[in-house]
């Protein structure tokens, strides 16, 4: 483990400071990590890392003269699971062919760069769950259709916060299993079109905090479990609650929006088919005490949870509960009540 220009320990190579003006061609091919920090690299040329079969991580950080990443830079690296490209304000261009065939990729960070367009991810084809972390790229204005198709065969988390995103096209997330989508702090983002999630499964978590989004899409919210829309002042109304089949947590801007969830009943069609198998809707209604938010069975039932009573053994009370317990904030209070404020004598 030795190199004339780059520091090294246990197959980790750190090429650091202004003396590094190009990727050294003689870096050992058995390296497991490469870090290029505070260098004067202007270009990362085609095939810079070819042959690094053991490579697991690449970091390219604080390179203030870096302008271009060429094709085939992150390509055919079977063990590469982490790429970090950050703090390169003059990086304006990442070749569409830069990322290819990275079956082990789990984390890709691109932050504080000058790029104007999302790189092409369609040839990455990871076999792992991927966290794509794209932040603080103020020149990225548009998320085009199919932007993330081919990124992973597994589910993905997309952190697209603090960019300059102004426009997201229909089918932008087509082909993805979207566990989480964070669009927060894109201050000029106004619209999520109705078909933005067309072809995607998810998102399960959606964050549009501190954007100018004024409406949520009418389609694609079926899997949404957590919605975050803090300081999203233009979001004055939510879609019909029957769009939120799976919602369990909402962090919103206006307390009045939480009122909608207070006494919300799921539609019959939204209950799982198993709910009709062991116990009837009427039985549930009978067991529901007035004012209760949850179905509660008698506490002294000795066989509950033990599986010996077939009446209850296959029954999932959360799944089949027609009342939805959504944790919502900010909670309504005396100054932001759910009722018409004229109903309060003291205020009237």
């Amino acid at each position: 483990c030795h190199h004339w220009l780059c520091h090294c320990s246990n197959r980790v190579f750190l090429c650091q400071d202004s003396k590094v003006t190009e990727i050294p061609p003689d870096l050992p091919r058995n390296a497991i990590e490469l870090r290029f920090v505070l260098t004067k690299l202007r270009v990362i040329p085609k095939g810079s890392f070819s042959g690094f079969g053991d490579l697991e991580k690449i970091e390219i950080s604080q390179n203030d003269v870096l302008e271009v990443i060429e094709a085939d830079v992150f390509s055919n690296l079977p063990n590469l699971h982490e790429i970090r490209i950050e703090k390169a304000n003059n990086l304006l261009y990442i070749n569409p062919e830069a990322f290819q065939n990275l079956p082990s990729l789990r984390y890709l960070l691109i932050s504080n760069t000058g790029i104007k367009h999302l790189p092409a991810f369609h040839k990455i084809q990871s076999l792992q769950k991927v966290l794509l972390d794209i932040q603080d790229n103020i020149n990225i204005h548009i998320i085009a259709r199919n932007s993330f198709m081919g990124l992973s065969f597994e589910s993905v988390i997309l952190w697209l916060n603090k960019n300059g995103i102004q426009e997201i096209h229909n089918c932008a997330f087509n082909g993805t299993q979207l566990d989480e989508l964070n669009l927060s702090d894109n201050n000029n983002l106004e619209e999520l079109p109705d078909d933005v999630f067309q072809g995607a499964s998810g998102p399960v978590v959606l964050d549009i905090s501190r954007t100018k989004v004024y409406s949520l899409p009418n389609h694609g919210l079926e899997n949404l479990k957590k919605l975050r829309a803090r300081s999203t002042y233009r979001l004055k109304k939510l879609p019909s609650l029957d769009k939120f089949v799976m919602l369990i947590e909402a962090s919103l801007t206006y307390p009045s929006h939480c009122c909608a969830f207070a006494n919300w009943r799921r539609q019959t069609s939204e209950l799982h088919p198993i709910c009709n198998k062991s116990i009837s809707r009427q039985d549930i209604d009978d067991m529901t005490q007035p004012g209760d938010q949850r179905v509660s069975l008698v506490d002294d039932e000795p066989s509950y949870g033990k599986g010996s009573d077939m009446l209850y053994s296959e029954f999932d009370y959360d799944l089949c509960n027609e009342f939805v317990d959504v944790t919502c904030s900010p909670k309504p209070d005396a100054f932001n009540p759910c009722e018409d404020i004229m109903g309060y004598n003291i205020l009237r």
């Epitope: 030795h2 190199h3 004339w4 220009l5 090294c8 320990s9 980790v12």
Partner: antibody
Framework: QVNLKESGPGILQPSQTLNLTCSFS??????????VGWIRQPSGKGLDWLAH???????RYNPALKSRLTISKDASSNQVFLKIASVVTADTATYYC????????????WGHGTTLTVSS | DIVLTQSPASLAVSLGQRATISCRAS??????????LNWFQQKPGQPPKLLIY???NQRSGVPARFSGSGSGTDFSLNIHPMEEDDTAMYFC?????????FGGGTKVEIK
Amino acid sequence: QVNLKESGPGILQPSQTLNLTCSFSGFSLSTSGMGVGWIRQPSGKGLDWLAHIWWDDDKRYNPALKSRLTISKDASSNQVFLKIASVVTADTATYYCVQINYGNYRFDNWGHGTTLTVSS
Amino acid sequence: DIVLTQSPASLAVSLGQRATISCRASESVDNYGISFLNWFQQKPGQPPKLLIYAASNQRSGVPARFSGSGSGTDFSLNIHPMEEDDTAMYFCQQSKEVPWTFGGGTKVEIK
């Protein structure tokens, strides 16, 4: 095979200027990644890094002595020089010339040292 | 400046046994995953000789009985099995930041 050899005056009086020369072979200071430095060791004591110079003429000094130190090189003749102004008795030590590899800042090869005594 | 404190100041070890020298830095000498900590051996009348660089990497030609470990602020040099020829002073040195500094040294001898 790398060799480094230090030469100096041996004895100086306080306030005089120390001029040290390191003559080396087996590598070139024109080669990227190469550097030469100076380290001193008072008799029976620890080691103090003084200064070094890289192939690209980039120089680094120990801040505690910076005002008195000057390092320079003549790559064509494979020599590095260190000047220490206004010596005092505390400068009495063995002075080593060292080949430094930029990768890991490794002190790869050392000269045998030259002894300086500062005495009035 | 980064201060390196070595302990013990001296150490007597039986032949074939393990000698362990500690080096503690006043602040971390790690940078982007690499520890800029080296170990030197110095015998009387000779210049120091590099044994270990970047905390745990053995310089070529150095016997395998010398090994280094640690990260951040705490490092150690192990000699095992101890041989007669290993009687010497051992110094740690950091090159994370200027001024590059050395530990005060540990004298190792045969018991």
